[in-house]
């Protein structure tokens, strides 16, 4: 984990100010509105299954 202003998060992750840690961009599939998803190259929209399983 890292603080803002230091080295960036590892590949495939992005800094979350809300959670104060690096988070996996992969989780943006399930939670696309997370603050850190803005820092991910491409956050695909949540599929319908996650909203109406």
């Amino acid at each position: 984990e890292q603080a803002p202003g230091t080295a960036p998060c590892s590949r495939g992750s992005s800094w979350s100010a809300d959670l104060d840690k690096c988070m996996d961009c992969a989780s943006c599939r399930a939670r696309p509105h997370s603050d850190f998803c803005l820092g991910c190259a491409a956050a695909p929209p949540a599929p319908f299954r996650l909203l109406w399983p």
Epitope: D18, L19, S27, R49, P53
Partner: antibody, heavy 119, light 111 residues
Framework: QVELVESGGGLVQPGGSLRLSCAAS????????MSWVRQAPGKGLEWVAE??????????HYAESVKGRFTISRDDSKNSLYLQMNSLRAEDTAVYYC??????????WGQGTLVTVSS | DIQMTQSPSSLSASVGDRVTITCRAS??????????MHWYQQKPGKAPKLLIK???NLESGVPSRFSGSGSGTDFTLTISSLQPEDFATYYC?????????FGGGTKVEIK
């Protein structure tokens, strides 16, 4: 440090009810999805139920095996997760684990509480 | 529902051995970018512990001798040099859709 502590397990007769609780600390509980996962004696892991966030209107999802009998709920003001279990069957006998995760992989696990359904 | 098939169900190995466990999903659990497959370790009488998420991302604090690979339907957990504390049962789990399902487990025993 992260801690999840389950309670409420015990011996109950078939057809009976039990309410499990899970007290969470060490992480932002209100931001994390929560699930119950169970493990029958000597068997593997089985996902039971999930509850999402206030922003998701506390959406819930259940395994077919417990749908209509179990109800998952949470109280973010108390950092607590619950599982109301009704119409219990012998096959519900298991250790029940409380798990927390931002999404996908279950990062945090409690120590488990044993539920025994037997006459 | 997506079925998860783990193999072998058990194996005997010695300290220092390279151990490989496989998990096959009944349908793809990957996008073009990520795989929604995770691995857990469970020791007797203890709760499972997350080792690897998204097929290959090592969880913080997990020794580097553990690694994960795969995409689509076929995934592998590898322990490069088995240590005494690694004797446990390992489970895979997908998070592609609800219901989440786990593999049947692989028990790693001492030879």
């Amino acid at each position: 440090q992260v801690e999840l502590v389950e309670s409420g397990g015990g011996l109950v007769q078939p057809g009976g009810s039990l309410r499990l609780s899970c007290a969470a600390s060490g992480f932002t509980f209100s931001s994390y999805w929560m699930s119950w996962v169970r493990q029958a004696p000597g068997k593997g892991l089985e996902w039971v139920a999930e509850i999402r966030l206030k922003s998701d209107n506390y959406a819930t999802h259940y395994a077919e095996s417990v749908k209509g009998r179990f109800t998952i709920s949470r109280d973010d003001s108390k950092n607590s997760l619950y599982l109301q279990m009704n119409s219990l069957r012998a096959e519900d006998t298991a250790v029940y684990y409380c798990t927390g995760y931002y999404a996908d992989a279950m990062d945090y696990w409690g120590q488990g509480t044993l539920v025994t359904v037997s006459s | 529902d997506i079925q998860m098939t783990q193999s072998p169900s058990s194996l005997s190995a010695s300290v220092g051995d390279r151990v490989t466990i496989t998990c096959r999903a009944s349908q793809s659990v990957s996008t073009s970018s990520y795989s929604y497959m995770h691995w857990y370790q469970q020791k007797p009488g203890k709760a499972p512990k997350l080792l690897i998420k998204y097929a290959s991302n090592l969880e913080s604090g997990v020794p580097s001798r553990f690694s994960g690979s795969g995409s689509g339907t076929d995934f592998t957990l590898t322990i490069s040099s088995l240590q005494p504390e690694d004797f446990a049962t390992y489970y895979c789990q997908h998070s592609w859709e609800i219901p989440y399902t786990f593999g049947g487990g692989t028990k790693v025993e001492i030879k």
